[in-house]
Amino acid sequence: TPKIVDLPDHIEVNSGKFNPICKASGWPLPTNEEMTLVKPDGTVLHPKDFNHTDHFSVAIFTIHRILPPDSGVWVCSVNTVAGMVEKPFNISVKVLPKPLNAPNVIDTGHNFAVINISSEPYFGDGPIKSKKLLYKPVNHYEAWQHIQVTNEIVTLNYLEPRTEYELCVQLVRRGEGGEGHPGPVRRFTTASIGLPPPRGLNLLPKSQTTLNLTWQPIFPSSEDDFYVEVERRSVQKSDQQNIKVPGNLTSVLLNNLHPREQYVVRARVNTKAQGEWSEDLTAWTLSDILPPQPENIKISNITHSSAVISWTILDGYSISSITIRYKVQGKNEDQHVDVKIKNATITQYQLKGLEPETAYQVDIFAENNIGSSNPAFSHELVTLPESQAP
């Protein structure tokens, strides 16, 4: 009769994929069809793989996802012409561990971070065989890096300065497939090297060829000599210039620039070590030509006494204001009303106090340091009768 061999009475498995093996001897050797595995719920499984030697048949079963409810008595069954044999064995399915809390950052420098991995409490089953700390820079398409950890407190070295990182912990329990899901993520940012950038940076156009950069006075915390480094580059062209400004100054005039061009400027405070760059500031030099007409002009929401006019303007022409000029159709040119909008970021205005049942001619133009744009076309506006008032 066949005999089932090498099958322990108790097996502990981790949830996930599981490939149990049933091994049997006897003559004739059991075939693939003669070996089955019965789950605790009575489900009969057939081998996914099968091989034999001169003395043994080996049936390999596949359970794609074994879960704790599958725990219990499983039965390996062999049924040949020589007879039938069954061997029960106990399977205990364990839940993979996962930390409940994100790791805590105790301290950071410009290239290191001290972390409490907070591996306990965790969800799932122990015992924990090993722990991994996973980390990677945010905003980089890099794979997660990891280090094996034995203590709760660990130092991460060789980090990039002023970089945001993500951290999480992965716990591993004994047995095959014991790697749990990573726990909650913590973000932190490494410190910068050197002094912080100047505060209160402001960049304004001064003329067609100059921009003025100003900042608050710098009071160094040490006796070291320091200076302000200003970098300016053109958006349209690729030229770049770095200027060194004595540390006691609070402004610099950037000159020899081109009219109607956008520049990006940043600054830092350097000692022997280079400081941290400021955020980019952008500004346009003043225009050398008249501004173009406002575009996308739209008159809508017309009532008996009002109408909404909206528009867009092009960047880079140093437009300081928008004027809406309107007059009753057929009246003299000098009988117009001008509405001057001094905030060029405003792109909509409600004309109010119009007369009912009146035809108006509306012009809109932009002003800059050179002059006013030239409207090629007027817009018509006919107010509604009062009976149409909402």
Epitope: Q293, E295, N296, I297, K298, I299, S300, H304, S310, W311, T312, Q329, P356, E357, T358, A359, A376, F377, H379, E380, V382, T383, L384, P385, S387, Q388
Partner: antibody
Framework: QVQLQQPGAELVRPGASVKLSCKAS????????MNWVKQRPGQGLEWIGM????????RLNQKFKDKATLTVDKSSSTAYMQLSSPTSEDSAVYYC????????WGQGTTLTVSS | DIQMTQSPSSLSASLGERVSLTCRAS??????LNWLQQEPDGTIKRLIY???SLDSGVPKRFTGSRSGSDYSLTISSLESEDFVDYYC?????????FGGGTKLEIK
């Protein structure tokens, strides 16, 4: 000078949707509404709807809400009207007209729906 | 929808004669009315907008006026090119609506 160019004629099979065009020149296309108007043979004019090219805001005559779709292509300063599932009732001349107050008109496209 | 009733639907007149075409609005439309001219080849041109404002390039013989809910287009002295179709159009309330048209024929 302001010009609205429309193809002279279009022939379409019943049920096959058709897209009529109106190419604008001589003014700032995105600063004026564009209207579409229908005229059946020997009949009067009927307003279909209008679109503002700056943001594609559209106002449609309810009668044409399931028939006409108005769009624009700012890069080519062209307004379009697509007519879905045309029937012989849609055979007509279709005009585009500039502005809220219809100050300039295209020459019209004669649409024939025939198998 | 606002109804625009245009009359007469056709009119025979002689060169040099003075004629008036009328549109009546079913609701108050204020001055929100245009007069359009359509030639036999289909070409449409705006003559008058906002009831009485003459478009540039339009001869002075064309005038627009209003009396209550009646709107008139008057041609003071007919010339040969005036014998075409005319439509009124209101744009006070959507949907914009046209009059039925007047065919001006030479007598």
């Amino acid at each position: 000078q302001v010009q609205l160019q429309q193809p002279g004629a279009e022939l379409v099979r019943p049920g096959a949707s058709v897209k009529l065009s109106c190419k604008a020149s001589g003014y700032s296309f995105t600063s004026y509404w564009m209207n579409w108007v229908k005229q059946r043979p020997g009949q009067g004019l009927e307003w279909i709807g209008m679109i503002h090219p700056s943001d594609s805001e559209t106002r449609l005559n309810q009668k044409f809400k399931d028939k006409a779709t108005l769009t624009v292509d700012k890069s080519s300063s062209t307004a379009y009207m697509q007519l879905s599932s045309p029937t012989s009732e849609d055979s007509a001349v279709y005009y585009c007209a500039r502005g809220y107050y219809f100050d300039y008109w295209g020459q019209g496209t004669t649409l024939t729906v025939s198998s | 929808d606002i109804q625009m009733t245009q009359s007469p639907s056709s009119l025979s007149a002689s060169l040099g004669e003075r004629v008036s075409l009328t549109c009546r609005a079913s609701q108050d439309i204020g001055i929100s009315l245009n007069w359009l001219q359509q030639e036999p080849d289909g070409t449409i041109k705006r003559l008058i907008y906002a009831t009485s404002s003459l478009d540039s390039g339009v001869p002075k013989r064309f005038t627009g006026s209003r009396s209550g809910s009646d709107y008139s287009l008057t041609i003071s002295s007919l010339e040969s090119e005036d014998f075409v179709d005319y439509y009124c159009l209101q744009y006070v309330s959507s949907p914009w609506t046209f009059g039925g048209g007047t065919k001006l024929e030479i007598k």
